[in-house]
């Protein structure tokens, strides 16, 4: 008959270390007799044996853990007591180590320069990982601008165009490393005007390159802007190289005009923009005219073939590189505004203009050019045109350039000479004095005062009916 | 002295049912864990399925879970294992062993000679 | 479950040599591992527990080693009767796993 022993734990427990998912095993030997009951602990609270994550071997005297998680973590002790002697405990800790992971990997990012940048980088890991980062195939230095943050995160101040690149962070622990997937900083650059568009004075009809570089990531669009609109005529050439963008636009100038190169880039949901403005100003061209020479010839375009006298001569100013054309391409330019206007005033407009572009011309020692009679003008302007004419007025008052006729080269009628006073030194519009004959079909024109159709006429003249003015006979 | 005895094997149709014995003496055999092992002709050992003492504490090798069935008799001092559903890869020899608790973990310190069991149609 | 790989899967080896059977384990096992000797036809052997302690009747030339996760058995000088096959096992876990085997031949 064997003698009662109290329970001796010839194993004392020892620490386990184990990782997430692996078996961890607890070992409490014990000598007594009669056989121990033995219980098991985790901090202090009972562990319930039938829970199917334990398993007991041996009477107890082996605690499995079948598959450790992270709150598997703690101080475990086994009891023995078989009612000899007091109980009896061993304790030993269980510490769930964890192989690096990257829980927070970080993301692809864009962002403008100068601001600051962090790419996250959150881990887990028993013991705790160290961050590092590589750039490229290099590890990333750290320096004034460049941190690696107590949370992995990479801080970047002051993005710099030359940070852009491939990014991945490294969790390394002693039982392994964990590798991010690779990442792109993209560094954005605002739009930046490099070279501006240079001003410029030149005679009319001239052709003018204006000229404007930007630079930016991604690379800027340029439009151009005439007076507030977009540009309507000359040509653009673009060229990109290293991200700059050389835009040329080539003008025909016919009038003075503000042009704006506007280089914009979008980053996200917004635009960045920058602008650059010149002035192309025309020298004063009617005082040029008057001077200047020219010839005459016979109208052999196309645009005031049905407007012009068949066979006529014209003037053309030889202040022009190109004569003819350039007083084509003005026609042409012209006609295309008219498109605009109302069927009234379109008609009794391109007489003006084409009488005013290719005016008569009478040949000898100095070819003269013959202008257009005043009253023609007028009557174009204030009655034919009033609308448009008073629209386009209007608008240019309050720096609005846009109606049908804002562009057309019309002439100035208070400084044309007056049919009255010499009916041969100006040109009438025959046009004008056959629709006098249909007078019936203008809008009605009271004796007194002209309707709301019509400008406000010289107080000298009441109506188109009446005024000696405006008598075509 | 420790001794183990199997029997009950021999051949059986694939699908057939067997159920293997093992006779225990020289040792106390209420108090000790046991175990079937096995060995396929020409290949190395696969521990099978183990029980406690009290039969409170039973473990089956992750491969063979549902069809086989360990248990025991302490007053016959014997154990079993069932085996249904039994395949061709079952075909083995099914060795007894005695599980005792070592300085560290646990060991087969005592084997029976093994009874043969043959799958085959 | 715990994988055991051992190696070589064979041996062969001469009387009076020195000899290394490796074992290793798919995570760490403390010292859960015992080595066993089987010759043809019989059943096992227990040799080794505890990863370094001779089991009672086991000659002295066998000795055992390793812990965590490698272990390995040594046969100091081998003698005619321990031309067998020798097996690694781990009881850290409830569901005990072998090594696949070693047959030490005589060269």
């Known amino acids: 008959e064997k003698l009662p022993k109290a329970p001796v734990i010839t194993t004392p427990l020892e620490t386990v270390d184990a990782l997430v998912e692996e078996v961890a095993t607890f070992m409490c030997a014990v000598e007594s007799y009669p056989q121990p009951e033995i219980s098991w602990t985790r901090n202090k609270i009972l562990i319930k044996l039938f829970d199917t994550r334990y398993s007991i071997r041996e009477n107890g005297q082996l605690l499995t853990i079948l598959s450790v998680e992270d709150s598997d973590d703690g101080i475990y002790c086994c009891i023995a007591n078989n009612g000899v002697g007091g109980a009896v405990e061993s304790c030993g800790a269980l510490q769930v180590k964890m192989k690096p992971k990257i829980t927070r990997p970080p993301i692809n990012v864009k962002i403008i320069e100068g601001l600051k940048a962090v790419l996250p980088c959150t881990t887990m890991g028993n013991p705790k990982p160290s961050v590092s980062w590589i750039k490229g195939d290099n590890a990333l230095r750290e320096n004034s601008r460049i941190a690696v943050l107590e949370s992995g995160s990479l801080r970047i101040h002051n993005v710099q165009k030359e940070d852009a690149g491939q990014y991945r962070c490294v969790a390394k622990n002693s039982l392994g490393t964990a590798y991010s997937k690779l990442v792109k900083l993209e560094v954005e650059v605002f739009a930046r005007i490099l070279r501006a568009p240079e001003s410029h004075n030149v005679t009319f009809g001239s052709f003018v390159t204006l000229r404007c570089t930007a630079i930016g990531i991604p690379v800027p669009t340029i439009s151009w802007i005439e007076n507030g609109n977009a540009v309507s005529s000359g040509s653009i050439q673009e060229s990109v190289k290293d991200r700059v963008i050389d835009s040329r636009l080539q003008l025909f100038i016919t009038k003075p005009g503000l042009y704006t190169c506007i280089a914009t880039n979008k980053h996200g949901e917004k635009f960045s923009t920058a602008k650059a403005a010149a002035t192309v100003s025309i020298a004063e061209w009617s005082k040029s005219q008057k001077d200047s020479q020219g010839y005459c010839a016979q109208y052999r375009g196309e645009v005031c073939d049905a407007v012009l006298a068949k066979d006529a001569l014209v003037f053309f100013n030889t202040s022009y590189r190109d004569p003819e054309d350039a007083q084509e391409l003005l026609i042409h330019t012209a006609w295309n505004e008219l498109k605009a206007v109302s069927p009234l005033c379109r008609p009794a407009a391109e007489a003006l203009l084409c009488n005013h572009l290719f005016q008569e011309c009478s040949p000898g020692v100095v070819p003269t050019p013959m202008p257009i009679c005043r009253e023609y003008c007028l009557a174009v302007k204030e009655l034919f045109c009033a609308k448009e004419w008073q629209a386009m007025e209007g608008k240019a008052h309050r720096g609005l350039y846009r109606s049908g006729m804002h562009l057309l080269p019309v002439p100035e009628c208070s400084k044309l000479p007056s049919m009255h006073r010499d009916p041969t030194a100006c040109t009438r519009l025959p046009y004008l004095d056959y629709k006098k004959e249909n007078i019936t079909t203008f809008p009605s024109i009271t004796s007194s005062r002209p309707s709301a159709d019509i400008p406000n006429l010289p107080a000298s003249t009441s109506s188109f009916a009446v005024s000696p003015a405006y008598s075509m006979t | 002295e420790v001794q183990l005895v199997e029997s009950g094997g021999g051949l059986v149709k694939p699908g057939g049912s067997l159920r293997l014995s093992c006779a225990a003496s020289?040792?106390?055999?209420?108090?000790?864990?046991m175990a079937w092992v096995r060995q396929a002709p020409g290949k190395g050992l696969e521990w099978v399925s183990s029980?406690?003492?009290?039969?409170?504490?039973?473990y089956y090798a992750d491969s063979l879970k549902g069809r086989f069935t360990i248990s025991r008799d302490n007053a016959k001092n014997s154990l079993y294992l069932q085996m249904n559903s039994l395949r061709a890869e079952d075909t083995a020899v099914y060795y007894c062993?005695?599980?005792?608790?070592?300085?560290?973990?646990?060991?087969?310190?005592?084997w029976g000679q093994g009874t043969l069991v043959t799958v085959s149609s | 479950d715990i994988q055991m790989t051992q190696s070589p899967s064979s041996l062969s080896a001469s009387v009076g040599d020195r000899v290394t059977i490796t074992c290793r384990a798919s995570?760490?096992?403390?010292?859960?591992v015992n080595w066993y000797q089987q010759k043809p036809g019989k059943a096992p052997k227990l040799l080794i527990y505890?990863?370094?302690t001779l089991q009672s009747g086991v000659p002295s030339r066998f000795s055992g080693s390793g812990s965590g996760t490698d272990f390995t058995l040594t046969i100091s000088s081998l003698q005619p009767e321990d031309f067998a096959t020798y097996y690694c096992?781990?009881?850290?876990?409830?569901?005990?796993?072998f090594g696949q085997g070693t047959k030490l031949e005589i060269k």
């Open positions: 062993a005695r599980e005792r608790l070592l300085r560290l973990g646990v060991g087969f310190d005592s």
């Open positions: 995570q760490r096992i403390s010292g859960f």
């Open positions: 505890a990863a370094s």
């Open positions: 096992q781990q009881s850290y876990s409830p569901l005990y796993t």
């Open positions: 029980v406690s003492g009290d039969s409170h504490h039973i």
């Open positions: 020289g040792f106390t055999f209420s108090a000790s864990t």
